[in-house]
Interface confidence: low
Amino acid sequence: YKAEVTVSQVYSGSLRVLNRHFSQDLGRRESIAFRSESAKAQKMLQELVASTRLGTYYNSSSVYSFGEGPLTCFFWFILDIPEYQRLTLSPEVVRELLVDELLSNSSTLASYKTEYEVDPEGLVILEASVNDIVVLNSTLGCYRYSYVNPGQVLPLKGPDQQTTSCLWHLQGPEDLMIKVRLEWTRVDCRDRVAMYDAAGPLEKRLITSVYGCSRQEPVMEVLASGSVMAVVWKKGMHSYYDPFLLSVKSVAFQDCQVNLTLEGRLDTQGFLRTPYYPSYYSPSTHCSWHLTVPSLDYGLALWFDAYALRRQKYNRLCTQGQWMIQNRRLCGFRTLQPYAERIPMVASDGVTINFTSQISLTGPGVQVYYSLYNQSDPCPGEFLCSVNGLCVPACDGIKDCPNGLDERNCVCRAMFQCQEDSTCISLPRVCDRQPDCLNGSDEEQCQEGVPCGTFTFQCEDRSCVKKPNPECDGQSDCRDGSDEQHCDCGLQGLSSRIVGGTVSSEGEWPWQASLQIRGRHICGGALIADRWVITAAHCFQEDSMASPKLWTVFLGKMRQNSRWPGEVSFKVSRLFLHPYHEEDSHDYDVALLQLDHPVVYSATVRPVCLPARSHFFEPGQHCWITGWGAQREGGPVSNTLQKVDVQLVPQDLCSEAYRYQVSPRMLCAGYRKGKKDACQGDSGGPLVCREPSGRWFLAGLVSWGLGCGRPNFFGVYTRVTRVINWIQQVLTGGGGSGGGGSHHHHHHGSHHHH
């Protein structure tokens, strides 16, 4: 005799009893009415299962909750199924067996026929697990049923000191969807919240779970697929306050079927977004957007933010949204990079874009901007990176495209190519009134507009000039004079310690900022406009440093231990972290501080010049870093502002030193032999380069490095030209405050060193 191997299969679900009605007592598990009714309903469920062929497998069951409307019973039951039948008894099959029994004319005296008028249509059976039952049982001491009426905002209070875990079973009218709002109120929190697209905590119906506070998402709203949701709130150790406000409402289903016709222009024309954006999209989301282009000269570009699409095998579900575009199946995924999906138009001038949630697990709502691009020249003067759909500078010595193709096939890399014989000359020699090419082609077209390219400067009227770095050089190169606008910057106030550095003189670096908390210098920064200071995002990594209210910014400061008449201080009214900043890779390590009042410029306080995106800082050039950081690795911060000259390093050289962890948003400076470098406390401070005009331009921000001043390891700086678009966007009020997906922070202090 061989014992048959069985497996415990757990099913969860609900049924409606048409001849019973919900009462408030039934909503409280501790009431006598609940205990009595749940025992009867459990017996009825047991009889129902037993009267089908599932009866022989029956193990146990429970009715754990009741809901509004005709009385809704929420239950689970366990069947011990022979191993070989495990796959044949899916929730759909089990439901069918139970519905058939409910509809049959059998003359049974069982309570599901005599006492309870069970609605077969309303029977819901879902797959569950033993673990789901364990989680459910752990919350039964604090189980709260709430019916959410339309128009009502229902606050949900956290577990009290006696209970560690609570479950809300939320239900609303059948034609509406449940929406939960979670708002962080504290920077320090250890509580967990999990939201399920079901009446109970079924792992397979998890919508999202949240642990720890997210500064990137101070408020999150989460949609269920329909009128039922379960929310489990588990209290963390030593958590004496609710770290967030939780509330819920019932909302109408929002349609996302759109037909649009685009105009024949190349700028952004609008956006598509999931219902209730920026709410998490619902597990039942199905959007269909049909876009028509004016002619086949154009392709359609979809611009995503912190979200990208990629091919996925057909047998794999998309876990963060499925996209169908021109019969191509793509999966969305969260990323801390920009991304564009380019849709070429070949035979038809229309395209349908479908977005579907394939699983219950969802994520922040998706917003995609759309524009047209010229199919014959998608990236005028630049390189189309087919990996991410972006236009990137070509042959500038920086691999912007993840596969590096923008730097392949270059005749002249980061140099000017003579038309006569393809020889290469360094960029500063172009339009310098000194012919270097064989026939002087480097000095031609210097007074007129040229096609835009990697190193051409774009004027405000969108025309381009050939002369490299024409900004603020005292000569008007643009027809509209825009290269000489906003030039109240970059001049040292008076004539003219960092590792290997020397002491600075007063007014020598009038843009230098000291960012302090409670009188202690934490990071450097640079003044870039009358209310704005730029610094490194990693200065704000620690949760205890995340609030702008904590910071004081000093300008015109020389010594840390004393004040002098030339220095001024400011509070910070707003803090903007780059939305793509990633602490582990140090990518996009830039932040902007808005000061509480405007700066009055003086000899000791004035801004540095910001470079254009096309500004070329030549490898080998000597530039300067300044700060109050440590003067040796592991040493204390300096009292007096230090300065040191460093050499800009070619990207490939630096990339090799750091085993290819150097992104296009990074720039390296220092020396192979080390000695001169930034160090702890210099983070966020300026790396500035002097142009021939005498003006100083911000090339980088102190970001990270291996140790300080070590041989073969350069200092790594945020490359300002690669984040300048975001800087301008924030300065002109275009937001950019750092959405960037659900992105939790655990950080390690200033000037990372490994």
């Epitope: 087919s386 691999k399 590096g404 193709l405 096939n409």
Partner: antibody, heavy 124, light 111 residues
Amino acid sequence: EVQLVESGGGLVQPGRSLRLSCAASGFTFNDHVIYWVRQVPGKGLEWVSTISWNSDTIAYADSVKGRFTISRDNAKNALYLQMNSLRTEDTALYYCAREKDGDFYYDYFAMDVWGQGTTVTVSS
Amino acid sequence: QSALTQPPSASGSPGQSVTLSCTGTSSDVGYYNYVSWYLQHPGKAPKLMIYEVSKRPSGVPDRFSGSKSANTASLTVSGLQAEDEADYYCSSYAGSNKVVFGGGTKVTVLG
């Protein structure tokens, strides 16, 4: 199993043409740069041609430039080498090889999967 | 593009180390850190042993190590074993999407 299988080799007279094929399986073909490399019996390896995953970057060795054409059909997971104006010095075993997966910013220019090769003999 | 220079042969006894050299120019081996090494047994396809000068693909024993100095790359096989007897080829990226191979070194395991 990751595999590359070459075919189309044979005996051909100088000046004539031949088309080699390489069938890929077991990996996402259109994620990879692919190479043709040849080897004269008893001699060393010689790089012949490279094609990027979307065919927008193609390169040839000086010895075959203007005579050979590399192409790929990602829908069919296939790589081709059209060889025209064949010369006796083109006699060799022709391999197709896949470039090793690149890390985030760099290609490796290293071939981690090779076929078994197909023999081309150019003789009158 | 001219081939990289490799010595035609090298040998060593089991357990010993053998170092193979691969000399190029300042525009291939000297400029790029994209040197690879391949092993080829008679009648078989080449097998990648080292890429990016010194990185080993998974499955390659740590007896194989690579390095580079100026225009010369080296492959060291330590603790020589009978199955290491084979032809070894180096290759380097040479710019403009071109790859250049060495002429190969025949390694003999003595005894």
